[in-house]
């Protein structure tokens, strides 16, 4: 899977959207590595 910063940001945005934004506060692109996906 793509693990560039931009890919991680877009994947996280999709995850946030699907979860309705109900995630931990520290669940942000600069804290979340590609392995989290």
């Amino acid at each position: 899977a793509c693990d560039t910063a931009t890919c991680v940001t877009h994947r996280l945005a999709g995850l946030l959207s699907r979860s309705g934004g109900v995630v931990k506060n520290n669940f942000v692109p600069t804290n979340v590595g590609s392995k989290a996906f």
Partner: antibody, heavy 119, light 107 residues
Framework: EVQLVQSGAEVKKPGASVKVSCKAS????????MNWVRQAPGQRLEWIGD????????NYNQKFKGRATLTVDKSASTAYMELSSLRSEDTAVYYC????????????WGQGTTVTVSS | DIQMTQSPSSLSASVGDRVTITCKAS??????VAWFQQKPGKAPKSLIY???YRYSGVPSRFSGSGSGTDFTLTISSLQPEDFATYYC?????????FGGGTKVEIK
């Protein structure tokens, strides 16, 4: 409102260095990567590198490795791009850009900083 | 580095026309492609990410498609404010790379 405000135009001599700043507001600066891109007159866009403002970790285009240095001042929500050993081919508009998720999912760009390298 | 080859480099069109711009990557980039619009003297404006998703506020006349190596940006009905230069970008691999641009001019 998310804003990326860059420093003003610079004129430099060949061999000198330039440091461009990008002040972020309207979102949590440390949450999102900052990219730097340049565009020489009449040329395509060229990615310089990105920085994780939270950790200071960087990725560079090998073309600029050793000449470009990306840094941040977290307390000032400001990113910096320094380019050394300037040559005439470095004359370009330099942009900072960041893809933000909250408050608005969008790819925000600074207004650009013109750097002219001339003897 | 991955090369992004855009075509055509320029085109002339009229208001209301359907315009198609293509971008070919030198290797597989999955759907990790973005499209930008740039007007003279201005910063690029993001239109599309992940090959086919519009950012909020981008008019529905802009659409993107493709995966792997071949990508397309379509403007279904060209408006006066759409005359600009358009760039594709791949962000699948470092370094991110851009196409050479397509200038959309008034016929």
């Amino acid at each position: 409102e998310v804003q990326l405000v860059q420093s003003g135009a610079e004129v430099k001599k060949p061999g000198a260095s330039v440091k461009v700043s990008c002040k972020a507001s309207g979102y949590t600066f440390t949450d999102y990567y900052m990219n730097w891109v340049r565009q020489a007159p009449g040329q395509r866009l060229e990615w310089i590198g990105d920085i994780n403002p939270n950790t200071g970790g960087t990725n560079y285009n090998q073309k600029f490795k050793g000449r470009a240095t990306l840094t941040v001042d977290k307390s000032a929500s400001t990113a910096y791009m320094e380019l050394s050993s300037l040559r005439s081919e470095d004359t370009a508009v330099y942009y900072c850009a960041s893809i933000i998720i909250v408050p608005n999912y969008f790819d925000y760009w600074g207004q650009g900083t013109t750097v002219t390298v001339s003897s | 580095d991955i090369q992004m080859t855009q075509s055509p480099s320029s085109l002339s069109a009229s208001v209301g026309d359907r315009v198609t711009i293509t971008c070919k990557a030198s290797q597989n980039v999955d759907t990790n492609v973005a499209w930008f619009q740039q007007k003279p003297g201005k910063a690029p404006k993001s239109l599309i990410y992940s090959a086919s998703y519009r950012y909020s506020g981008v008019p529905s006349r802009f659409s993107g498609s493709g995966s792997g190596t071949d990508f397309t940006l379509t403007i279904s009905s060209l408006q006066p404010e759409d005359f600009a230069t358009y760039y594709c970008q791949q962000y699948n691999n470092y370094p991110y790379t851009f196409g050479g641009g397509t200038k959309v001019e008034i016929k």
